[in-house]
Each structure stands twice: as structure tokens, then as C-alpha cells.
């Protein structure tokens, strides 16, 4: 049998049953999530659930830039260091950079310091690039 790989929206890239859109415009975390949702298909800020997924995403983004952090779908809505993915995925894989998680930093970004393989927490009202994800 021929199995057709699902297609992603123009400009989005495909990896392991998911489509990803890397948006190079500046949005705060909540506006970024709203923009992801506006694309339909159940899109949200991206959850990153394995090293393989993280590596694929990091390699893709490094082709575009290597200096600006990027919002992902991990946040701490209760502000109690109880992190969760906005798309409801299980928070099992973690890749924090090891920086202090204190202060008013309750949203997660892919850090450019380690080629986007590790995460840092940041203030949610900061405007940054963002990564969306949906399953086609």
C-alpha cells in the first residue's frame, strides 16, 4: 500500500505526524497562542515532547537565525512552578537550561544560547518569535 504523508499549510514544515510553523514576528506569549489557534486544525504554541522532536525543530530554526529566543507552548499558569503544555500534552520530557526559574517568568522559550535545544523561562509579556504546531 502507498501511504501518503499528510501535507502542511504553506510555509509550515512536517515532522513525525505534526506540522510546525515558525513565525518570525514579535508577539507576547498569549497573543502568540491566539495567533496559533487562529490557523485552525487545533494549532497551539508547540509542545516539544522528545529529544528527537527538539533536535528537528532546532535544526530547522537554526537555518533562519541563531540569536532570538522563540516562544513554545509551555507555561506556568498558576505561577507555582507547575509547568504544563497549552495543548494538553503530558509534561514528561524537559530540557531546561538550568537557569533560575524565579521572578515573574512563567512562560517558556527555546533559548538561542544552546542552538534552541534547551528552554528558559521568561516574562510572558515579552514579544518574541513563536512556534506553532498542529496534527494534520
Amino acid at each position: 500500500d502507498i501511504i501518503m504523508r499528510p501535507s502542511c499549510a504553506p510555509g509550515w514544515f512536517y515532522h513525525k505526524s505534526n506540522c510546525y510553523g515558525y513565525f518570525r514576528k514579535l508577539r507576547n506569549w498569549s497573543d502568540a497562542e491566539l495567533e496559533c489557534q487562529s490557523y485552525g486544525n487545533g494549532a497551539h504554541l508547540a509542545s516539544i515532547l522528545s529529544l528527537k522532536e527538539a533536535s528537528t525543530i532546532a535544526e530547522y530554526i537554526s537555518g533562519y537565525q541563531r540569536s532570538q529566543p522563540i516562544w513554545i507552548g509551555l507555561h506556568d499558569p498558576q505561577k507555582r512552578q507547575q509547568w504544563q503544555w497549552i495543548d494538553g500534552a503530558m509534561y514528561l520530557y524537559r530540557s531546561w537550561s538550568g537557569k533560575s526559574m524565579g521572578g515573574n517568568k512563567h512562560c517558556a522559550e527555546m533559548s538561542s544560547n544552546n542552538n534552541f535545544l534547551t528552554w528558559s523561562s521568561n516574562e510572558c509579556n515579552k514579544r518574541q518569535h513563536f512556534l506553532c504546531k498542529y496534527r494534520p
Epitope: G11, R24, L26, D31, S38, G63, R127
Partner: antibody, heavy 120, light 110 residues
Amino acid sequence: EVQLVQSGAEVEKPGASVKVSCKVSGYTFTGDYMHWVRQAPGQGLEWMGRIDPKYGDTNYAQKFQGRVTMTRDTSISTVYMELSRLRSDDTALYFCATDNSGLYDAFDKWGKGTTVTVSS
Amino acid sequence: QSVLTQPASVSGSPGQSITISCTGTSSDVGGYNYVSWYQQHPGKAPKLMIYEGSKRPSGVSNRFSGSKSGNTASLTISRLQAEDEADYYCSSYTTRSTRVFGGGTKLTVL
């Protein structure tokens, strides 16, 4: 259908200012950056700057810093480009263009252009 | 003076292939996958032909292709047709978060 509708031709005197508008329809106004690009008669394209309609943030080409101001009115889905202290070499066709929601980093929708003539 | 360098003109016969180059620096063309190409017919607005160096928007013929090597991007048009006669411009994102254009190349189909 996405449309960028620009204001009509302008004739201005040297030293004056001109304000060109670009009205958006067919997509979420606050979703896309809007850029302004000009083209002098018989010349190439020149990027002037861009505005983020969501927040009003701007980024201008160094050449136009201090002379150009880009603004927006979200209530009527319109962006504006004002160029002050006009000179004869500002005579050009002025285009607004969008960059497709930040995915392409390219200008995939263009207005038809507004002719600005600077003459005494 | 344009930041990106393009040949002023190129020409080719119908059915042939031509390539237009666009040379910048590591701060623009060489530093990013952000090169785009535009076609402009006289009196018309430019039309996006290639984005991110080598990707075609829907509706653009597969006769148009883009590539990049180092600080130079290229647009290739295969199987030239009369309607391809136009001006072509490259553009790139820069390290200052600005955009720059090349000076433009006039394509003549002989």
C-alpha cells in the same frame, strides 16, 4: 480575497509632508506586518520600513530615520506612511506590502501603488 | 546604491534557461534563509516568485527555482517564455531586522 487598497496620487512641494494610506481587507489586519516600498521613476525597489499593526511597533530603514512615520488605525484596518521634508528625489511610486503572517519573510501581497510627485 | 548586487540585464531565447545572481554579505544573503525574488512587469506591482531562497508560492510556475551558495542567491528560469520578460528583484532580511533589495535585473526574451 486579500486586498490592499492605497490612497490616490499626491503632488507636493519641496519641504512639505505627504501621508499615504493602505486599507486592508480579506484577512486579519493585526496578523501581518505591513511594509512600505518605493520605486522612483525608472529605478529599482527600495525598502522604507514596516509596522506591526498589532502593537504599532515600527522599524525603519536607516536612510529614512527621522523623516518617515508609520502608523495604523485598527478600527478601519488602515496603515499610513508619512514622509516629511520632501525633496524632488522623493518623487516615486509608493507601495504597501504584507509579509504573510511572518512565515515567509517575503512580500506576497502588494497594493497597486500611490504616485507621489514632489515639484515646486 | 543597492545593497544587493544583481546584473543589470540578462537575455535568453524562448525555451532556454537563464540565471540571475544576487550577491550580498554575511549580514544579509549569507546569514539567513530569507532571500525572496520578485517579478515586476511595467506599470504593475511586484509579484512574489520565490521565498526562503528556494520555495515557490502556490500559483507560481515550477519553471522558476531559487538557490543560494554563500553570500550569493540565484534565480533560475527554465524553458523561457515571452511572458517572462520583466524586471526581477532579489530581497533579503538583514541582521538589523531590516530588508534590502537588489538593483534589479531586466530580463529580455529574444
